[in-house]
Interface confidence: low
């Protein structure tokens, strides 16, 4: 056959779907690899073809599109199950061809089981919300275009295994969720569960995403450099190892980026001449704040070294800071034979 | 509330059919389980149908007990069993922390 | 799978006295864990849910704690009427799993 543009196996888009649901999957050429959409295809004369690899087999085969109750049927870029057998899982293809034109690209689909209580292997998308910040809202995700705007879908929300009712803060609002007050507390697993009609059937939708409570920006601070401090002063012998800490803390802050790094006289420590390492640790609070330690490290100090500027700086969205470290050299405690004898007058 | 009824002598691989009759809330807004136990030992957890109909078993309990329900009950259907099944069989709304037990209902398997 | 070990599995304790019961998970049950207390010809009562949380109407005498694998019951001050067999029961999964509950613990009141 002619050649035929091929994007490989796409495992960027690792497709997870529940056993026993519907599934509706979009061909990826049109999404990421081409420049055009799946209408502007079919008008060009260009067939979408598809065919799956099983599981643990190398043979590609055809769909079979004539199974009972159309349970796999494609309409347009999108190739449905209604709904999903365990055996689904495979390696997908969807290949956009003409006499003269072949485009495919390959993705796997897994369908995972879920247990009563909503565990399974899926990988959980992540909502942040703030603390105590008034009331926000998570929505059930990813049930766009399984059913028309006509059918009026009963949703059901659980937090774990529990369906969420009467819960003091936390109120089931159709596709939203609503968190009065968002709270520790409210830290875990969230699912919602879309029950629709369609042809006489009922189908399940089950989504699940993870909610972490995280620091709100209205208590967001500046970094606050905890360590070097005004009240430490390192004081070392030439030939000791000199270790300060640079220990800064973080206020939550969506989407930004924190940084610490050092400075000796005024440089970055790589782009000067002494055996310096650094070792960076991050630990995080139940809120995300996070606390960033730099350990400046020079096994054997010189005097020289010991008279150099050493500046830890940090920085956020919510501003920059710097702080000096105080390092001086130590002066040796008197021989009293030899500099006491000299004070004395003897020769 | 929820009471259980439908327990009695029984033998060896017969069948029966236990019920759990809900008043005062809705099945479709709640997980059930059915928990038994023998005489003079502990809890042991059967199995439990969610709100939407699913229903989930204990390993050793998959394929010898059927958990199924309606508007208003909740069934355990027990095939073949056996002498070890000798026990007291309770219904209990909700599985994360069940907040709602029926008294149970004495299944007796002898021959 | 989810495995439940009580222990002890019985214990003698003095009027005014504490208790500790512990429930250990072979795997961990982000805090899908429930106590029960029950007294003989009696279906279990629910004491705490979600590891910590006390159920409506129940002593703040009885205390849950724990987190992963490792859960504990608590009873301060422990009363005539605490005498009872006392189980957890892991919500997390109820799936494919041996027992749900803990073997139980007897709390003998001198």
């Known amino acids: 056959s002619e050649r035929c543009d091929d994007w490989g196996l796409d495992t960027m888009r690792q497709i997870q779907v529940f056993e026993d649901e519907p599934a509706r999957i979009k061909c990826p050429l049109f999404e990421h690899f081409l420049k055009f959409n799946y209408s502007t295809a079919h008008s060009a004369g260009l067939t979408l073809i598809w065919y799956w690899t099983r599981q643990d087999r190398d043979l590609e085969e055809p769909i079979n599109f004539r199974l009972p109750e159309n349970r796999i049927s494609k309409e347009k870029d999108v190739l449905w199950f209604r709904p999903t057998l365990l055996n689904d899982t495979g390696n997908y293809t969807c290949m956009l061809r003409n006499t003269t034109y072949c485009s495919k690209v390959a993705f796997p689909l897994e369908v995972v089981q879920k247990d009563s209580c909503f565990n399974s292997p899926m990988k959980l998308p992540v909502h942040k919300l703030y603390i105590e910040y008034g009331i926000q809202r998570i929505t059930c995700p990813n049930v766009d275009g399984y059913f028309p705007s006509s059918v009026k879908p009963t949703i059901t929300w659980y937090m774990g295994c529990y369906k969420i009712q009467n819960f003091n803060n936390v109120i089931p609002e159709g596709m939203n969720l609503s968190f009065l007050i968002a709270l520790i507390s409210n830290n875990g697993n969230y699912t919602c569960v879309v029950t629709y009609p369609e042809n006489g059937r009922t189908f399940h939708l089950t989504r699940t995403l993870t909610v972490k409570v995280v620091g709100s920006p209205k208590n967001a601070v500046p970094p606050v450099i905890h360590s070097p401090n005004d009240h430490v002063v390192y004081e070392k012998e030439p030939g000791e190892e000199l270790l300060i800490p640079c220990t800064v803390y973080f206020s939550f802050l969506m989407d930004s980026r924190n940084e610490v790094w050092w400075t000796i006289d005024g440089k970055k420590p790589d782009d000067i001449t002494i055996d310096v390492t650094i070792n960076e640790s991050i630990s995080h609070s139940r809120t995300e704040d996070e606390t960033r330690t730099q350990i400046l490290s020079i096994k054997k100090v010189t005097s020289e070294d010991l008279k150099r500027s050493y500046v830890c700086h940090a920085r956020s969205a919510k501003g920059e800071v710097a702080k000096a470290a105080k390092v001086k050299q130590k002066v040796p405690a008197p021989r009293y034979t030899v500099e006491l004898a000299c004070g004395f007058g003897a020769t | 509330s929820l009471e259980e009824s439908g327990g009695r002598l029984i033998t060896p691989g017969g069948s029966l059919t236990l019920t759990c009759t809900v008043s005062?809330?809705?099945?479709?807004?709640?997980?059930m389980q059915w928990v038994r136990q023998a005489p003079g030992k502990g809890l042991e957890y059967i199995g439990y149908?969610?709100?939407?109909?699913g229903s989930y078993y204990a390993s050793w309990a998959k394929g010898r007990f059927t958990i199924s329900k309606t508007s208003t009950t909740v069934d355990l259907k027990i095939t073949s069993p056996t002498t070890a099944d000798t026990a007291t069989y309770f219904c209990?709304?909700?599985?994360?922390?069940?907040?709602?037990w029926g008294q149970g209902t004495l299944v007796t398997v002898a021959s | 799978a989810y495995d439940m070990t009580q222990t002890p599995a019985s214990v003698e304790v003095a009027v005014g006295g504490t208790v500790t019961i512990k429930c250990q998970a072979s795997?961990?049950?982000?805090?899908?864990l429930a106590w029960y207390q029950q007294k003989p010809g009696q279906p279990p009562k629910l004491l705490i849910y979600?590891?910590?949380t006390l159920a409506s109407g129940v002593s703040s005498r009885f205390k849950g704690s724990g987190s992963g694998t490792d859960y504990t019951l608590t009873i301060s001050g422990v009363e005539s009427a605490d005498a009872a067999t006392y189980y957890c029961?892991?919500?997390?999964?109820?799936?494919?799993?041996?027992?749900?509950f803990g073997g139980g613990t007897e709390v003998v009141v001198k």
């Open positions: 029961q892991q919500g997390y999964s109820g799936n494919n799993v041996d027992n749900t």
């Open positions: 005062g809330f809705s099945l479709s807004s709640y997980h």
């Open positions: 209990a709304r909700d599985f994360a922390g069940s907040d709602l």
């Open positions: 149908i969610n709100s939407l109909g």
């Open positions: 795997q961990s049950i982000d805090y899908y």
């Open positions: 979600r590891a910590s």
